[in-house]
Amino acid sequence: DSEEDEEHTIITDTELPPLKLMHSFCAFKADDGPCKAIMKRFFFNIFTRQCEEFIYGGCEGNQNRFESLEECKKMCTRDNANRIIKTTLQQEKPDFCFLEEDPGICRGYITRYFYNNQTKQCERFKYGGCLGNMNNFETLEECKNICEDGPNGFQVDNYGTQLNAVNNSLTPQSTKVPSLFEFHGPSWCLTPADRGLCRANENRFYYNSVIGKCRPFKYSGCGGNENNFTSKQECLRACKKGFIQRISKGGLIKTKRKRKKQRVKIAYEEIFVKNM
């Protein structure tokens, strides 16, 4: 009765301290404030470990609010110049690096790259173009950056265990948010629910990017933002499956986003969000 998957034994041998933030306010929730402006801002999401977009109302709120993605990254993720160290026992790779290659069920035969945990190297494979899993990269470089160790145990990329000069302790850090974790679906899926300015109480759904689920909310009947769907299925389709289904002043506009533009993100969702 094995206590864990054999191939992960080494990795789970050592407990890793959690992410240490440069500023404690980076852990604050996105706070749109009580005002009603529609201002695009960015916040650091402690649970996704990345900077994400939200709509700010224009007043109050908190310090976890940045004018640009770059400013957010600068304040809340580590500088690339920091040296990153990885050892066999103290490593923090994304879990998906350990998933087996998965071409999916479609027949596109696109060249992609995956991390082979047996050979400890990134290798080419043929991806069908849909489903599959997150161990799926457009370039060899991206795969190496995220999943491979560099020479002498040095991690070449963004995820790793950083030697803290102050107390010589090992702390996993995210030095930058790689492109893999940028949400390539509709950007409004990352905005908070906004009931708008009118007085109706219509049942709508919005995509909650913190928990990765579609949730109900009451819509006032006017204003608000595009993270607003008349059914849960519409919400899931738009924000999980790469279909754009938005509500605008002119009513429903239904367009289809080509899977190509979704890149690996579709696969990511399929693996990580199954039970809504």
Epitope: L19, N62, C97
Partner: antibody, heavy 125, light 107 residues
Framework: QVQLVESGGGLVQPGGSLRLSCAAS????????MTWVRQAPGKGLEWVSV????????YYADSVKGRFTISRDNSKNTLYLQMNSLRAEDTAVYYC??????????????????WGQGTLVTVSS | DIELTQPPSVSVAPGQTARISCSGD??????AYWYQQKPGQAPVLVIY???NRPSGIPERFSGSNSGNTATLTISGTQAEDEADYYC??????????FGGGTKLTVL
């Protein structure tokens, strides 16, 4: 339906060891991080440990660090908690719980939406 | 890091409004969650993301969170609401933290 069932609790002497198991069903176990939460008799809830979805990252409360080991076998849909060097203050009902998803990442979400019924661990001589 | 403090007990007459507080340094900047636990049972989530109710939770349960206090409000309290209530949030590293719990007695 979504279900978590703990087992392995019982009476153990101080300094002894015990391994708890949690069998998951009704959802794709390998897609979720998992946690252990405990509750001493008549006391409040205390978060104990979390393990990421594939099992490559583990974190512990200071009170159990170095003594407890969380692990998982995704092929068996089972979560484990190996408890060594047990103390009287480890006496508690141990709950296995599923945190929500953290958007599109391998981390855990900010709260638990599914809980097991708990298994009692008594550390006494 | 964040410590969450709850009153050990709160009493309320049936049909009245019960308010259970959860104080923590700047908790309003983090999301608060509330669980209900009845004797011999596992906790059940009643409020998530400060003020949202999971499906199946009665409308009389509501939540708010600002400054240093998160509050669970039960309006029109019923006998079946008698239980222990726990607030939960997270620290600046994303690890989960619970309050000490409040025993709600319906008189």
């Amino acid at each position: 339906q979504v279900q978590l069932v703990e087992s392995g609790g019982g009476l153990v002497q101080p300094g002894g060891s015990l391994r708890l198991s949690c069998a998951a069903s009704g959802f794709t176990f390998s897609n979720y991080a998992m946690t252990w939460v405990r509750q001493a008799p008549g006391k409040g809830l205390e978060w104990v440990s979390v393990i990421s979805s594939v099992g490559s990252n583990t974190y512990y409360a200071d009170s159990v660090k170095g003594r407890f080991t969380i692990s998982r076998d995704n092929s068996k849909n089972t979560l484990y908690l190996q408890m060594n060097s047990l103390r009287a203050e480890d006496t508690a009902v141990y709950y296995c719980a599923r945190p929500t998803k953290a958007g599109r990442t391998w981390w855990w979400g900010p709260y638990m939406d599914v809980w097991g019924q708990g298994t009692l661990v008594t550390v006494s001589s | 890091d964040i410590e969450l403090t709850q009153p050990p007990s709160v009493s309320v007459a049936p049909g009245q409004t019960a308010r259970i507080s959860c104080s923590g340094d700047n908790i309003g900047s983090y999301y608060a969650y509330w669980y209900q636990q009845k004797p011999g049972q596992a906790p059940v989530l009643v409020i998530y993301d400060d003020s949202n109710r999971p499906s199946g939770i009665p409308e009389r349960f509501s939540g708010s969170n600002s400054g240093n206090t998160a509050t669970l409000t039960i309006s029109g309290t019923q006998a079946e609401d008698e239980a222990d209530y726990y607030c939960q949030s997270y620290d600046s590293t994303g690890l989960l933290v619970f309050g000490g719990g409040t025993k709600l007695t319906v008189l």
